[in-house]
Interface confidence: medium
């Protein structure tokens, strides 16, 4: 994953999890915990910022509880003793649903954002610079824990109002139906569409169901290449497509195509032999003009995992790689609902596709 200028993320860590925060907590450090609340077992989970691995000294204990209508407990533990609880009688998490939890360390407090919305602030009871470990336990599955210190500014910063540097490799959970957000899109309503998550068996017992089709089973943790699938309902403003995979060590090129009949409405073509990310449209077997400009260095690296997030807007596609916005591609084929086929090919191994 392309997490520039910060500690490398912990990817898909097993729970319970404890990991070192390199350099400890610093003013301005943002830590993102991305995962899914388990729907079956347990009624609690916790994220702890602590000293060492014992759990006796926890500067900040963030503890959502699905009990008594749901609430979140914040507390501090010193020498094994808990202080007075601070309770927030609001539950921003839902069982079985993914979440993105972002902590901002500041001189006076921790600020906590859940799913892009500021949720709570917790004033320091002990000096935060003592913290060198983050731990997560309880009924939660983790996708990643990432770190970003704004003092090391990447060329193209991801964002600061929401959790950033996220690889967007969500656990493949059913999302159900969704609608466009109000106020943002043009007046014509987007269709209500089912998300389809194409899954593979990555480990015993880790198969998830999808709301629209049964899981696609393969004998090894990879998709067949080239991979072709239908985008139910085609594209429309607010439609998003997520792909994750790994670039082969000797990769030359790969492509992600969004197709409309015989046309390729959007051709995304990372080329390692040219150190470029080429975008184009093919209509009646004729290619248009290439777009190659990037706001930062080539985000795809041979031998490394990646995620690509394509968001359809009214005028363009927005593409993020490893959670950071990379470019916009203005629609050349404007009949969005007819763009209903995804094709992936080339020198990569796919691990997750969500259309």
């Amino acid at each position: 994953m392309a997490f520039s200028g910060s500690q490398a993320p912990y990817l898909s860590p097993a729970v319970p999890f404890s990991g070192t925060i390199q350099g400890g907590l610093q003013d301005g450090l943002q830590i993102t915990v991305n995962g899914t609340v388990l729907s079956s077992s347990g009624t609690r989970f916790a994220v702890n910022f602590q000293t060492g691995f014992s759990g006796n000294d926890i500067a900040f204990h963030f503890n959502p509880r699905f009990e008594d209508g749901g609430y979140v407990v914040c507390n501090t533990r010193q020498n094994g003793s808990w202080g007075p609880e601070e309770r927030k009688t609001h539950m921003p998490f839902q069982k079985g649903m993914p979440f993105d939890l972002c902590f901002l360390v500041q001189s006076s407090d921790f600020k906590v954002m859940v799913n892009g919305i500021l949720f709570v602030q917790y004033f320091h009871r002990v000096p935060f610079h003592r913290v060198d470990t983050i731990s997560v336990n309880g009924s939660v599955q983790l996708s990643y824990i990432s770190f970003q210190n704004p003092r090391t500014v990447p060329v193209q910063p991801a964002f600061s109002t929401v959790p950033f540097s996220q690889p967007v490799c969500f656990p493949p959970r059913p999302r159900g139906r969704r609608q466009k957000p109000p106020g943002v899109w043009p007046a014509n309503p987007a269709p209500i569409t089912q998300t389809v998550i194409h899954t593979v068996q990555s480990a015993p017992g880790q198969m998830f169901s999808t709301p629209a089709i049964p899981p696609m089973m393969y004998p090894h943790p990879a998709y067949p290449m080239p991979f072709i699938t239908t985008i139910l309902g085609g594209l429309y403003p607010s439609k998003s497509i997520l792909l994750s995979g790994t670039v082969l060590p000797s990769a030359q090129r790969f492509h992600i195509n969004l197709c409309s009949g015989n046309h390729i409405a959007f051709h995304l073509n990372p080329r390692f032999d040219e150190n470029a990310v080429v975008r184009n449209t093919q209509i009646d077997n004729s290619w248009g003009s290439e777009e190659r400009s990037l706001p930062r260095k080539m985000p795809f690296v041979r031998g490394q995992s990646f995620s690509v997030w394509i968001l359809c807007e009214a005028h363009c596609l927005k593409v993020a790689v490893d959670g950071q916005h990379l470019f916009e591609y203005y629609h050349r084929l404007r009949n969005l609902p007819t763009i209903n086929r995804l094709e992936v090919g080339g020198d990569i191994q796919l691990t997750h596709v969500q259309t």
Epitope: D100, M113, S160, V162, P181, V184, L242, A320
Partner: antibody
Framework: EVQLVESGGGLVQPGGSLRLSCAAS????????IHWVRQAPGKGLEWVAS????????SYADSVKGRFTISADTSKNTAYLQMNSLRAEDTAVYYC??????????????????????WGQGTLVTVSS | DIQMTQSPSSLSASVGDRVTITCRAS??????VAWYQQKPGKAPKLLIY???SLYSGVPSRFSGSRSGTDFTLTISSLQPEDFATYYC?????????FGQGTKVEIK
């Protein structure tokens, strides 16, 4: 149709208090973020305070911190700005405004807009002796 | 706090001109940058959100872009109704800051 209507402005002496109201229609304040933005005569826009109603989180500009309080009454679908210890430099037109709706979680690389799509007509607050 | 330095503070242009207004953030910010148009005695109107997304109903002659900490509003062909004051705005962890404004006047 989304509408925001401010009220409660007027003339007040330095050190005095005022409570501004913002009646919302066409959406629910309980699921939106509400901002107060002010504009002194002939000057630019200045953010004052915000309430993230879904969580109750509030934030304030340094210039008003400790003097102003933002709140919302979901039963009345109304947001408020309680202004205490008013100063001459607080004289301005005060706008109540709604944040653009967030994308849900699945669009976060672009997800939190922090932009204001609907504004009230404004209410003038004059602090003068 | 993050400051947004907007330039120029004013400019004179003619109908049909291409106009560019820039805001520079004092530190790394997200793409949660918006642009507004305000006319005298009126509330501001949202033009661009998320740095480059055109808000519903806004003419396509308005566009936004970013390069690092620089954010740009471009009016490709100035129309009579575009003479107004323009503001950029960023949002970071619940704190909002506006640029000082750019007044676009008729040449």
């Amino acid at each position: 149709e989304v509408q925001l209507v401010e009220s409660g402005g007027g003339l007040v002496q330095p050190g005095g208090s005022l409570r501004l109201s913002c009646a919302a229609s066409g959406f629910t304040v309980s699921s939106s973020s509400i901002h107060w933005v002010r504009q002194a005569p002939g000057k630019g826009l200045e953010w004052v305070a915000s309430i993230y109603s879904s969580s109750g989180y509030t934030s304030y500009a340094d210039s008003v911190k400790g003097r102003f309080t933002i709140s919302a009454d979901t039963s009345k679908n109304t947001a408020y700005l309680q202004m205490n210890s008013l100063r001459a430099e607080d004289t301005a037109v005060y706008y109540c405004a709604r944040n653009v709706e967030n994308y849900p979680y699945w669009a976060w690389p672009w997800g939190y807009y922090g932009a204001i799509d609907y504004w009230g007509q404004g209410t003038l607050v004059t602090v003068s002796s | 706090d993050i400051q947004m330095t907007q330039s120029p503070s004013s400019l004179s242009a003619s109908v049909g001109d291409r106009v560019t207004i820039t805001c520079r953030a004092s530190q790394s910010v997200s793409s949660a940058v918006a642009w507004y148009q305000q006319k005298p005695g009126k509330a501001p109107k949202l033009l661009i959100y998320s740095a480059s997304s055109l808000y519903s109903g806004v003419p396509s002659r308005f566009s936004g872009s970013r390069s690092g900490t620089d954010f740009t509003l471009t009016i490709s062909s100035l129309q009579p109704e575009d003479f107004a004051t323009y503001y950029c705005q960023q949002s970071s962890w619940g704190l909002i800051t506006f640029g000082q404004g750019t007044k676009v006047e008729i040449k």
